[in-house]
Interface confidence: low
């Protein structure tokens, strides 16, 4: 008996071939011997089966001795043995219809779980293997779960259902709702304007929700809410903002915040959360601000950084075009009695300069000038 696998909602074509290459009488019946369709001369006739309005054939093939049964908009319950009667012989075809659905919304937040459920006809014992967009293979039976979805899981999931050594492939588009970056770090000199950007890793027609930026300054004992905002159809409106610092927010996506100036008291870490309408859970992005200050007080030239720096970062003070006078894995370095000239304070990681501040040291009778 020939086995054909079909997909719920799809169209399937069951073949039936006669030895004579001409139009002769044929009938398609189900396992209960109820006629589905057949022919009378060159006309298609239909029987009283449940498939009535969804069953068809291709008259253009009859003259070649081919009498297919076409079933449209397949349902799981269409799974059955179909019998083609032609030339005093019977051809049996077993049709098994499967459906695969995401049992939740296909737009899921990062970190949430995806469950794929296989609908299958009674008596079948299929196996399912799904491949995520990043190529991970997941195997299962009637249900298949993936916990802790990541950004790379966005895209088309390809699932193969295997039954009787035949296979049918399903494609399910999954959108993982997340920020493009889980974390970012901004390095600024004291007094510079700071731009924070929070691009989303997905696009949807309408985006509505609300968000908040909580900030934990390095110098502060507790975190505080710097700004709250609403998002309606991709338009941003500020609800509440602190007086110090007075943040400004862009009115359109991507979410964009401006801090008028970087000051040591603002250095620290922030967590932007975004709650989307009709979604449980929130999107998160961490943002870090590192601030540098170079000062000269009497005979002491000092360079300091505030904020979440990694222990491997190097802070150096050097006279322009000369070797570093001092270089330490510390958050403050200084030089006593610095020579006159343009001094550079550098924050670097494995030789790559992340932040630089210049200060001009004048002869001892003058006062310092900050460029």
């Amino acid at each position: 008996k020939k086995v054909v696998l079909g997909k719920k909602g799809d169209t399937v074509e069951l073949t039936c071939t006669a030895s004579q290459k001409k139009s002769i009488q044929f009938h398609w019946k189900n396992s209960n011997q109820i006629k589905i369709l057949g022919n009378q001369g060159s006309f298609l006739t239909k029987g009283p089966s449940k498939l009535n309005d969804r069953a068809d054939s291709r008259r253009s093939l009859w003259d070649q001795g081919n009498f297919p049964l076409i079933i449209k908009n397949l349902k799981i319950e269409d799974s059955d043995t179909y019998i083609c009667e032609v030339e005093d012989q019977k051809e049996e075809v077993q049709l098994l219809v499967f459906g695969l659905t995401a049992n939740s919304d296909t737009h899921l937040l990062q970190g949430q779980s995806l469950t794929l459920t296989l609908e299958s006809p009674p008596g079948s014992s299929p196996s399912v293997q799904c491949r995520s967009p990043r190529g991970k293979n997941i195997q299962g039976g009637k249900t298949l779960s993936v916990s802790q979805l990541e950004l790379q899981d966005s895209g088309t999931w390809t699932c193969t259902v295997l039954q009787n050594q035949k296979k049918v492939e399903f494609k399910i588009d999954i959108v993982v709702l997340a920020f493009q970056k889980a974390s970012s770090i901004v390095y600024k000199k004291e007094g510079e304007q700071v731009e924070f950007s929070f691009p989303l890793a997905f696009t949807v027609e309408k985006l509505t929700g609300s968000g908040e930026l909580w900030w934990q300054a390095e110098r502060a004992s507790s975190s505080k809410s710097w700004i709250t905002f609403d998002l309606k159809n991709k338009e941003v409106s500020v609800k509440r903002v602190t007086q110090d610092p007075k943040l400004q927010m862009g009115k359109k996506l991507p979410l964009h915040l401006t801090l008028p100036q970087a000051l040591p008291q603002y250095a620290g870490s922030g967590n932007l959360t975004l709650a989307l309408e009709a979604k449980t859970g929130k999107l998160h992005q961490e943002v870090n601000l590192v601030v540098m200050r170079a000062t000269q007080l009497q005979k002491n030239l000092t360079c300091e950084v505030w904020g979440p720096t990694s222990p491997k970062l190097m802070l150096s003070l050097k006279l322009e075009n000369k070797e570093a006078k001092v270089s330490k894995r510390e958050k403050a370095v200084w030089v006593l009695n610095p020579e006159a000239g343009m001094w550079q304070c550098l924050l670097s990681d494995s030789g790559q300069v992340l932040l630089e501040s210049n200060i001009k040291v004048l002869p001892t009778w003058s006062t310092p000038v900050q460029p």
Partner: antibody, heavy 118, light 108 residues
């Protein structure tokens, strides 16, 4: 420095059990797929098991039902529980890290020897 | 199960020569899922190539990978003394994630 250090190998009788451990350092363990691969003396490499970041596990038919891979993200440990051991399981067992952006085992431990003999 | 066949079993060459190693899969796999490793006696394997043609970190550019479908190739353009070793291909296309039997490159 990224490091994988296996332990727990030894001599065990057929039908016995062993638990291999792999201590991880130098990277965010929870973000990576992890693998066990074995190699019998003078033979090629044989994939033994994989555990994904979501805890999804994979085994070849030769060990399915006998071996169990698990991970303890907080402690940065990968384990391989081996039951109903057979002489054919005698090998050096390596733990390896799966690539983050690609498929390939990019960091390997030095291996631990398992001998199944009466 | 996808079976990987490597040929030749042994390749005897001199330093400076070009080495061409073949890996054939019993069914078509996406190049994303093919990797090559090098193993020297008493050492753990080392990843050379992932995605059939991308060099892993720190791998010299004399190593290159190519191929698609069922036929993949590892080429060492000019053999250095340290390149004499056993080379394995591996597929991640579907579980079980099989290795090839290996090709030994030894000094002529």
């Amino acid at each position: 420095e990224v490091q994988l250090v296996e332990s727990g190998g030894g001599l065990v009788q057929p039908g016995g059990s062993l638990r291999l451990s792999c201590a991880v350092s130098g990277f965010t363990f929870s973000s990576y797929d992890m693998h066990w691969v074995r190699q019998a003396t003078g033979k090629g490499l044989e994939w033994v098991s994989t555990i994904g970041t979501a805890g999804d596990t994979y085994y070849p038919g030769s060990v399915k039902g006998r071996f169990t891979i698990s991970r303890e993200n907080a402690k940065k440990f990968l384990y391989l529980q081996m039951n109903s051991l057979r002489a054919g399981d005698t090998a050096v067992y390596y733990c390896a890290r799966g690539g983050y952006y690609y498929y390939g085992m990019d960091v390997w431990g030095q291996g631990t020897t398992v001998t199944v003999s009466s | 199960e996808i079976v990987l066949t490597q040929s030749p079993g042994t390749l005897s060459l001199s330093p400076g020569e070009r080495a061409t190693l073949s890996c054939r899969a019993s069914q078509s796999i996406s190049s994303t899922y093919l990797a090559w490793y090098q193993q020297k006696p008493g050492q753990a394997p080392r990843l050379l190539i992932y995605g059939a043609s991308s060099r892993a970190t720190g791998i010299p550019d004399r190593f290159s990978g190519s191929g698609s479908g069922t036929d993949f190739t590892l080429t060492i353009s000019r053999l250095e003394p340290e390149d004499f070793a056993v080379y394995y291909c591996q597929q991640y296309g579907s579980s079980p994630f099989t290795f090839g039997p290996g090709t030994k490159v030894d000094i002529k």
